[in-house]
């Protein structure tokens, strides 16, 4: 329970906190568990203890091992263990799993990625951020204090993010990097009873006999991905495919669009070579999903040709 895993890269600073907590006034002694050898407190040493903190400035692969910390108070002693592993720097970009800190999730509303362990270090801005080893560039990325903010998060923003900063100890600078995965949560969308945006209910559309005409049925269903939502046209209450008039065809497939953040679908009805009998038909725009069905009816009327005579 009072053991903590810590890891770092060779030639980088690593600071480890004792897993046992105590008041600042309590003394903390550190030992290298294998040899029971006391860790010095003098800052001239590469590895030294500083109260609750054990500092590797910089770390070496040979420093790997278990370190014991004993928090001493006038009335009790508390013992903790720090399991430290120092890894060789990878030559390639890939960050292995064992160097990864906990995964964080973000969404369009909350996209902060905190730099892991940074609070243990004496660092000054700016913090550098990399995604999959590439330096982050562009106005969507903002390094703010100890975290990165991503504006307008998209699923493509998921990946491994590395923060890099400089730890300062008595005027000497040491580099530190830490990597964690970022996943993008799809903000839970919602679905609504369909809302037909066009055509208006009982709309009269003017058409010219002999010309082509298009009618668009457009409806919105909610936010995010919509399930089993559809828009379609019917003629006199019959599916277009069953009506049997080859001049009147529905576009193949439904076009998806977004209006004010809502998910919408539209379907175009194409009437070729409009005939008199088409004016007698009832055109129904249907929008439906699991909440139910909404229907708007359109009728066609003849557009009078423009009289060019004086």
């Amino acid at each position: 329970k009072f053991s903590k895993q810590s890891w770092g890269l060779e030639n980088e600073a690593l600071i480890v906190r004792c897993p046992r907590q105590g008041k600042p006034s309590y003394t903390v002694d550190w030992y290298y568990s294998q040899t029971n050898k006391s860790i010095p407190t003098q800052e001239r040493n590469r590895v030294f203890a500083s109260g609750q903190l054990l500092k590797f400035l910089p770390a070496a692969v040979a420093d790997s091992g278990i370190y014991t910390c004993i928090v001493r108070s006038p009335t009790f002693n508390r013992t903790g263990y720090a399991n430290v592993t120092i890894y060789k720097k990878q030559s390639d970009c890939n960050v292995p799993d064992y160097l990864m800190y906990s995964t964080v999730s973000g969404s369009e509303k909350n996209s902060k990625i905190y730099c892991p362990t940074i609070d243990l270090y004496n660092w000054t801005a700016p913090l550098e951020w990399f995604k999959n080893c590439q330096a982050l560039q562009g106005s969507r990325y903002r390094a703010h204090k100890s975290f990165l903010v991503i504006d307008n998060v998209m699923t493509e923003d998921a990946g491994d993010y590395t923060c890099k900063f400089i730890h300062n100890e008595n005027g000497a600078n040491y580099s530190v990097t830490a990597t964690r995965s970022f996943t993008v949560k799809d903000e839970q969308g919602f679905s609504l009873f369909p809302v037909i945006g066009a055509p208006a209910q009982n709309e009269i559309k003017e058409v010219e006999i002999g010309k082509n005409a298009n009618l668009t049925c457009s409806a919105c269903f909610g936010k995010g991905t919509q399930f089993l939502a559809a828009v379609l046209w019917q003629l006199n209450g019959t599916k277009i495919t069953d009506f049997g008039e080859p001049r009147i065809q529905q576009e193949e497939g439904q076009n998806q669009s977004f209006s004010n953040g809502l998910a919408c679908l539209d379907m175009v009805l194409r009437i070729a070579d409009v005939k008199e009998e088409d004016l007698l038909l009832q055109y129904d725009c249907l929008a439906l999903n699991l909440h139910g069905l909404r229907r708007h009816t359109v009728r066609l009327s003849r557009k009078n040709p423009i009289d060019h005579h004086s």
Epitope: L228, A230, L290, L293
Partner: antibody, heavy 118, light 107 residues
Framework: EVQLLESGGGLVQPGGSLRLSCAAS????????MNWVRQAPGKGLEWVST????????FYADSVKGRFTISRDNSKNTLYLQMNSLRAEDTAVYYC???????????WGQGTTVTVSS | DIQMTQSPSSLSASVGDRVTITCRAS??????MAWYQQKPGKAPKLLIY???TLQSGVPSRFSGSGSGTDFTLTISSLQPEDFATYYC?????????FGPGTKVDIK
């Protein structure tokens, strides 16, 4: 008792046609989206098609689009699947299923077997 | 299309064991996850819908959890009648897709 009962399966040659039926009872049929789901021998489940409550809208898996047609007759409480241009890979047990609470298939039929072979 | 992966593909367990089956979606599906049990020669039976809601009539030893991409079906104490194949299914978007199944058999 809520029940679905499929029929119409059988042996058919590649390129042939078959019409499956599913008789529903014990619930208001038109209130529900209905579905066909199939399972090839020794394989997992595969969604085939969905139809809305009054048949206005239909949805298909890409593997059957243009070959299969889902329909329903609410006066008879019956769901249909017209299967044309059948292929060997359409061989499966075909289940009809009701889409219920939270978009899950809550009621299933016992299945009908379709074998496409020469 | 959203791919569903299940693990393990099969497992052997004893009566009384706690069994956990996981399902992962290739993209976030919110809580639109269902779990089914299928016995040889029978139709699937709905166990869990909306990721964690127990279907009426299903024993309380079955439970579901998870959201987004990672989901779990747990059988707290395996009973003889629970030896079957279990499928997960997403209904976040069409095409509706199922996991490949996890076969639970007797050790």
């Amino acid at each position: 008792e809520v029940q679905l009962l499929e029929s119409g399966g059988g042996l058919v040659q590649p390129g042939g046609s078959l019409r499956l039926s599913c008789a529903a009872s014990g619930f208001t049929f038109s209130d529900y989206y209905m579905n066909w789901v199939r399972q090839a021998p020794g394989k997992g489940l595969e969604w085939v098609s969905t139809i809305s409550g009054f048949g206005e809208s239909t949805f298909y898996a890409d593997s059957v689009k243009g070959r299969f047609t889902i329909s329903r007759d609410n006066s008879k409480n019956t769901l249909y699947l017209q299967m044309n241009s059948l292929r060997a890979e359409d061989t499966a047990v075909y289940y009809c299923a009701r889409l219920g609470a939270a978009r899950a298939f809550d009621i299933w039929g016992q299945g009908t077997t379709v074998t496409v072979s020469s | 299309d959203i791919q569903m992966t299940q693990s393990p593909s099969s497992l052997s367990a004893s009566v009384g064991d706690r069994v956990t089956i996981t399902c992962r979606a290739s993209q976030s599906i919110g809580s639109w996850m269902a779990w089914y049990q299928q016995k040889p020669g029978k139709a699937p039976k709905l166990l869990i819908y909306a990721a964690s809601t127990l279907q009426s009539g299903v024993p309380s030893r079955f439970s579901g959890s998870g959201s987004g991409t990672d989901f779990t079906l747990t059988i707290s104490s395996l009973q003889p009648e629970d030896f079957a194949t279990y499928y997960c299914q997403q209904s976040y978007t069409t095409p509706i897709t199922f996991g490949p199944g996890t076969k639970v058999d007797i050790k």
